[in-house]
């Protein structure tokens, strides 16, 4: 969790943090679920992808997301999942050439087809939270996290360090 200094001191640096290299340092293929074990699924509808948060039937296969990890030049704080003292950012891709994007104007999370280099809206600071959970903070809007709202992914503003453990911004990663 964040230290006493809270979100503000840490997130100020996100505005001017840049990715160390244009190449990810590593990638991981995982299913993404909420703190309450609902699955994040992706459906192709009318040539675009929709993102859903739903309970899957017992033997239903979970959708996988490719997490690409990038080093930021900015040092990590206590909560960031850092490597060699550097903050980690991730992009999330459920299928080739599509990435999750933060739409800060609409407070929404969308899937967009795009080419590399990816825009800043596709990058999220990775935070390792308690109980093997992670959270994703917008690079373009510090203090704003991917969260769950009305069975959809949305962008949720977190005002204080106490709210960082709120369940609707916590996610679980698993290989199954």
């Amino acid at each position: 969790a964040f230290g006493i200094s809270g979100v503000q001191k840490y997130t100020r640096a996100l505005h001017d943090s840049s990715i160390t290299g244009i190449s990810p340092i590593t990638e991981y293929l995982a299913s993404l679920s909420t703190y309450n074990d609902q699955s994040i699924t992706f459906a192709l509808e009318d040539e675009s992808y929709e993102i859903y948060v739903e309970d899957l039937k017992k033997d239903e296969k979970k959708d996988k997301v490719l997490l690409s990890y990038y080093e930021s030049q900015h040092p990590s704080n206590e909560s960031g999942d850092g490597v060699d003292g550097k903050m980690l950012m991730v992009t999330l891709s459920p299928t080739k050439d599509f990435w999750l994007h933060a739409n800060n104007k609409e407070h929404s999370v969308e899937l967009h087809k795009c080419e590399k280099p990816l825009p800043d809206q596709a990058f999220f600071v990775l935070h390792n939270m308690h109980s093997n959970c992670v959270s994703f903070e917008c690079k373009t809007d510090p203090g704003v996290f991917i969260g769950v709202k009305d069975n959809h992914l949305a962008l949720i503003k977190v005002d204080s360090s106490e709210n960082l453990c709120t369940e609707n911004i916590l996610f679980k990663l698993s290989e199954t």
Partner: antibody, heavy 128, light 108 residues
Amino acid sequence: QVQLQESGPGLVKPSETLSLTCTVSGGSIRSSIFYWGWIRQPPGKGLEWIGSIYYSGRTYYNPSLKSRVTISVDTSKNQFSLMLTSVTAADTAVYYCARAGGLYNWNDESFSFYMDVWGNGTTVTVSS
Amino acid sequence: EIVLTQSPGTLSLSPGERATLSCRASQSFSSSYLAWYQQKPGQAPRLLIYGASSRATGIPDRFSGSGSGTDFTLTISRLEPKDFAVYYCQQYDRSPLTFGGGTKVEIK
């Protein structure tokens, strides 16, 4: 800073099984975003990837060695291991363990790896 | 599998000179997933460059990588005495990952 150290017998008889262990210090295998792997280098020759593993136990092997190789992980000991069966003189090499970045190829749905932290290496000679 | 050919096999240069090492792939790959390693006698390889052009942690900026498709280059802008070693390229665009045969940079 993560460090890796190989251990195991330096001499193995032909047709027997080569077993090596890599101990990771300065970081937890379980909490790492990285993969772990084995590479070998025959005397005076180049490098050959043997295989890689994620802390969950998911493995990735070089097809040329796949039938003889098993890589396993023990997160409680912060170690991962290599077993190579039916060894011959051609398996004589310096064996390195390494931390690896794994990158995914959507086209053939496979992972490939580069190694960013290496152990010092251990020499294994196959001889009777 | 992708075959990597490094040239020249040996490069004889003096300290302070610029070294240019080439790595050519048998097939083009779009990802630029190419790494460069340095290996000194009796030591393990050390990662210099990943993603064709990103320097690994702690690598001095005299080392730079470039290239795409099938042709990649490692440049050492001003050779220091400790830079004389064997250099390997490695692709990780496709499994199995493969290494080049190496280029030895020796003191002239």
